[in-house]
């Protein structure tokens, strides 16, 4: 009381910090600085994120939230989780479509586009691997299918129809002789 | 919008007193620690008070700690700077400024005059 | 006491012209710093708090920068209404202290 000297940072709990004139406790996550604490070890005046925007941390310099983020419909993104005071909007994408990154060493955050799902059912192939973080993997063909080129061919239903020997091993063909 | 607006201010013999107002409004008065700021004529500015927002932390330079004494009233939004034992070289122009870090925000100012 | 040693204490400059105005503390206050501008019989406004944000409303060719002891406020291009004293002063610790302010004027 009465003196000159700005006291030292002696506050009980770990979260005060200098911040101006006075060792300040901050801001909570989804709150920005309005304006420091006014005397030692005080409460800062903290303010919730306005909509659409946000922070995730506890800080006690942020005198303004960041702006959340849209999903790039371009790229046929989607909000999986709507941003929130305390957390940004987190984009992917929609059920039968994969995250293709747009950079090689791919990150949380990198730039990315949503492709869709290889459809192995409409291909006439098992499916090996479910599309999520990558596109879906194909298998061997499906029964009543063989092999041919890079795709599945329709065993014969007739005599008329030629069968090779792929086609002959799968669809048993010659057995019907 | 913000306003400061300092009264109280006017002439007066060495040793006398004066007690100098701040009227504080659009803003929320008691979130906001507050300062008192003088001028000397054609002189520089210099830090004389400041009152935390509760009013339980006050602190006064050495030139004026002891004569002057910085209060508030948080119900009535105003801060207050009492003057005693005046000296001729505490005439200037008296500015209340509210604390956010910075002081963002200035009153006009108030004069005074300490002269026999 | 913080002594805040403000350079030069006069200026004067012509409209269009940058101009640099230097702030040194006696020791360091991190960026806890600002900028004041005061016109002839009115009251000092803020122009820049924390050595470089430039408050809300005040035009973007005025800037600050430094941190620890050295600052610097810059004016890119010299506007006849610029024509003011400009006053830095240091928060990191009380007492308060003020430069002594950089008149300056239009050549």
């Known amino acids: 009381q009465g003196g000159t000297r700005s006291p030292r940072c002696d506050c009980a709990g770990d979260f005060h910090k200098k911040i101006g004139l006075f060792c300040c406790r901050g801001c909570p996550a989804g709150h920005y600085l309005k304006a420091p604490c006014t005397e030692p070890c005080g409460n800062s005046t903290c303010l919730v994120c306005p909509q659409d925007t946000f922070l995730a941390w506890e800080n006690h310099h942020n005198s303004e939230c960041a702006r959340c983020q849209a999903c790039d419909e371009q790229a046929s993104q989607v909000a999986l989780e709507n941003c929130s005071a305390v957390a940004d909007t987190r984009c992917g994408c929609k059920p039968g479509w994969f995250v293709e990154c747009q950079v090689s060493q791919c990150v949380s955050s990198s730039p990315f586009y949503c492709q869709p799902c290889l459809d192995c059912g409409a291909l006439h192939r098992h499916t090996r691997l479910l599309c999520s973080r990558r596109d879906t993997d194909c298998g061997t063909c499906l029964p009543g299918f063989y092999e041919h080129g890079d795709g599945c061919v329709s065993c014969p239903t007739s005599t008329l129809g030629s069968c090779p020997e792929r086609c002959a091993a799968v669809c048993g063909w010659r057995q019907m002789f | 919008e913000v306003q400061l607006v300092e009264s109280g201010g006017g002439s007066v013999q060495p040793g006398g007193s004066l007690r100098l107002s701040c009227a504080a409004s659009?803003?929320?008065?008691?979130?906001?620690?507050m300062s008192w700021v003088r001028q000397a004529p054609g002189k520089g500015l210099e830090w004389i008070s400041y009152?935390?927002?509760?009013?339980?932390?006050?602190y006064y330079a050495d030139s004026v700690k002891g004569r002057f004494t910085i209060s508030r009233d948080n119900a009535k939004n105003s801060l207050y700077l009492q003057m005693n034992s005046l000296r001729a070289e505490d005439t200037a122009v008296y500015y209340c400024?509210?604390?956010?870090?910075?002081?963002?925000?200035w009153g006009q100012g108030t004069p005074v005059t300490v002269s026999s | 006491d913080i002594v805040m040693t403000q350079s030069p204490s006069s200026l004067s400059a012509s409209v269009g012209d940058r101009v640099t105005i230097t702030c040194q503390a006696s020791?360091?206050?991190?960026?806890?710093l600002s900028w004041y501008q005061q016109k002839p019989g009115k009251a000092p406004k803020l122009l820049i708090s924390?050595?470089?944000n430039l408050e809300t409303g005040v035009p973007s060719r005025f800037s600050g920068s430094g941190s620890g002891t050295d600052f610097t406020f810059t004016i890119s291009s010299l506007q006849p209404e610029d024509i003011a004293t400009y006053y830095c002063?240091?928060?990191?610790?009380?007492?308060?202290?003020f430069g002594q302010g950089t008149r300056l004027e239009i050549k």
């Open positions: 400024a509210r604390y956010s870090g910075a002081f963002d925000r």
């Open positions: 659009g803003f929320t008065f008691s979130s906001y620690g």
């Open positions: 009152i935390s927002s509760s009013g339980g932390h006050t």
């Open positions: 020791q360091d206050i991190s960026n806890y």
């Open positions: 924390d050595a470089s």
């Open positions: 002063q240091q928060y990191d610790n009380l007492p308060i202290t």
